[in-house]
């Protein structure tokens, strides 16, 4: 069975048209959202930004893989984006949406 | 198709003896570490503590499941524990270790 690559950030451009949001989002047309994927396997090196709990969980998983899963690869740093959109009353609003862009990933 | 259990906290007691750490950790003998597991599937409800990015990623996954994974179930709140241990010079040290206990989980 194939070995998965280690937990890391992957590039992903999200088009608001693809999501069906083009009628209420004016700008941008899309954004670089990115995503996290990959294995959190022993040993968890420094690049994996692992928490102490993730290190403990990895060791427990090795002892007891049927009951305790590996930690998962998740965002450790997220950025906001500004979105220009129509609200329910057709007013044009500029709003900053938090935690929209993955900047870094780690084992959690 | 089988019903998936949603992302949530699961109880897990970790024994330092099982980890082979009994020779350097004096106290405690173990601790309630817990772990996160479960599905982050559409729709992500309020209990799932999902980030904006996780909501977007879930929608992209539905459109393109082969290339973009579902968000993963990871700790959203972690607590510290105090550990009494021997250092390399056999001194007894009391240290607070951050991010050791899972208090809450969410979709990331």
């Amino acid at each position: 069975s194939e070995l998965k690559t280690a937990c890391k950030k992957h590039e992903l451009y999200v088009s608001f048209q693809d999501l069906g949001w083009q009628d209420w989002i004016i700008a941008p047309k899309g954004y670089a959202a990115n995503y996290c994927d990959g294995e959190c396997s022993f040993p968890l090196n420094a690049h994996m930004n692992a928490t102490n709990h993730a290190i403990v969980q990895t060791l427990v998983h090795l002892m007891n893989p049927e009951y305790v899963p590996k930690p998962c690869c998740a965002p450790t740093k997220l950025n906001a984006i500004s979105v220009l959109y129509f609200d329910d009353n057709s007013n044009v609003i500029l709003k900053k949406y938090r935690n929209m862009v993955v900047r870094a990933c780690g084992c959690h | 198709s089988e019903l998936k259990t949603a992302c949530k906290k699961h109880e897990l007691y970790v024994s330092f003896q099982d980890l082979g750490w009994q020779d350097w950790i004096i106290a405690p003998k173990g601790y309630a570490a817990n772990y996160c597991d479960g599905e982050c599937s559409f729709p992500l409800n309020a209990h799932m503590n999902a980030t904006n990015h996780a909501i977007v990623q879930t929608l992209v996954h539905l459109m393109n499941p082969e290339y973009v994974p579902k968000p993963c179930c990871a700790p959203t709140k972690l607590n510290a524990i105090s550990v009494l241990y021997f250092d390399d010079n056999s001194n007894v040290i009391l240290k607070k270790y951050r991010n050791m206990v899972v208090r809450a989980c969410g979709c990331h």
Epitope: L3, M63, E66, P69 | K4
Partner: antibody, heavy 121, light 112 residues
């Protein structure tokens, strides 16, 4: 005491189907991960697949030779594990065991007595 | 062919010590996963003999011991007895998808 009892084995033609059952007693079945392991006549043990607990979404995993043909399920209310075998091949001939996974180190601490499946024309 | 490699057979006289090796790779034993050992007496189901590398379930004599180093594990049997004649299997996991892997089995013959 802990007991696992398999049933449903027998003679089946290639391409046919069979459903094996494994009745559990003497323990809280729903709290355990359970597996199917097989042993062809005169050969070694071969892992077939497993099903996790409700808390892990009853996730299943299968060995490559049976993937897409075999399906593992469980009914915790009946304390029973199942193995649905479709598109059977002669090389599936084996004694099929169900096995419970102990909860601290994941070893197979209890096994059924096995049920023989013979695939032959 | 099994993912974990065991010698097909070993033998020893009563009272002797024998060891059975189990060689894996960096994706299973070498990845840090636990190793378990099973004993299968003729015509019976396998029985857990050693779990978590070196722990014995209750009822297993201390003549049986297990160890692990790097990508290999081994089972040692001291004070060999006629009733130890059986097939022995090692088992671990493959790290890529946490699939169960077995060794091919070792037939232990007690001489005499």
């Amino acid at each position: 005491q802990v007991q696992l009892v398999e049933s449903g084995g027998g003679l089946v033609k290639p391409g046919g189907s069979l459903r094996l059952s494994c009745a559990a007693s003497g323990f809280t079945f729903s709290s355990y991960v359970v597996h199917w392991v097989r042993q062809a006549p005169g050969k070694g043990l071969e892992w077939v697949g497993r099903i996790k607990r409700e808390s892990s979404s009853y996730t299943t995993m299968y060995a490559a030779p049976v993937k897409g043909r075999f399906t593992i399920s469980r009914d915790d209310s009946k304390n029973t594990l199942y193995l649905q075998m479709n598109s059977l091949k002669t090389e599936d001939t084996a004694v099929y065991y169900c096995a419970r996974v102990e909860r601290s180190k994941s070893g197979f601490d209890n096994w059924g007595q096995g049920t023989l499946v013979t695939v032959s024309s | 062919q099994s993912v974990l490699t065991q010698p097909p057979s070993v033998s020893g006289a009563p009272g002797q010590r024998v060891t059975i090796s189990c060689t894996g790779s960096s994706s299973n034993i070498g990845a840090g996963y636990s190793v378990h050992w099973y004993q299968q007496l003729p015509g019976t189901a396998p029985k857990l003999l050693i779990y978590g590398q070196s722990e014995r379930p209750s009822g297993v004599p201390d003549r049986f011991s297990g160890s692990k180093s790097g990508t290999s594990a081994s089972l040692a049997i001291t004070g060999l007895q006629a009733e130890d004649e059986a097939d022995y299997y090692c088992q671990s996991w493959d790290s890529s998808q946490t699939l169960v892997v077995f060794g091919g089995g070792t037939k232990l013959t007690v001489l005499g």
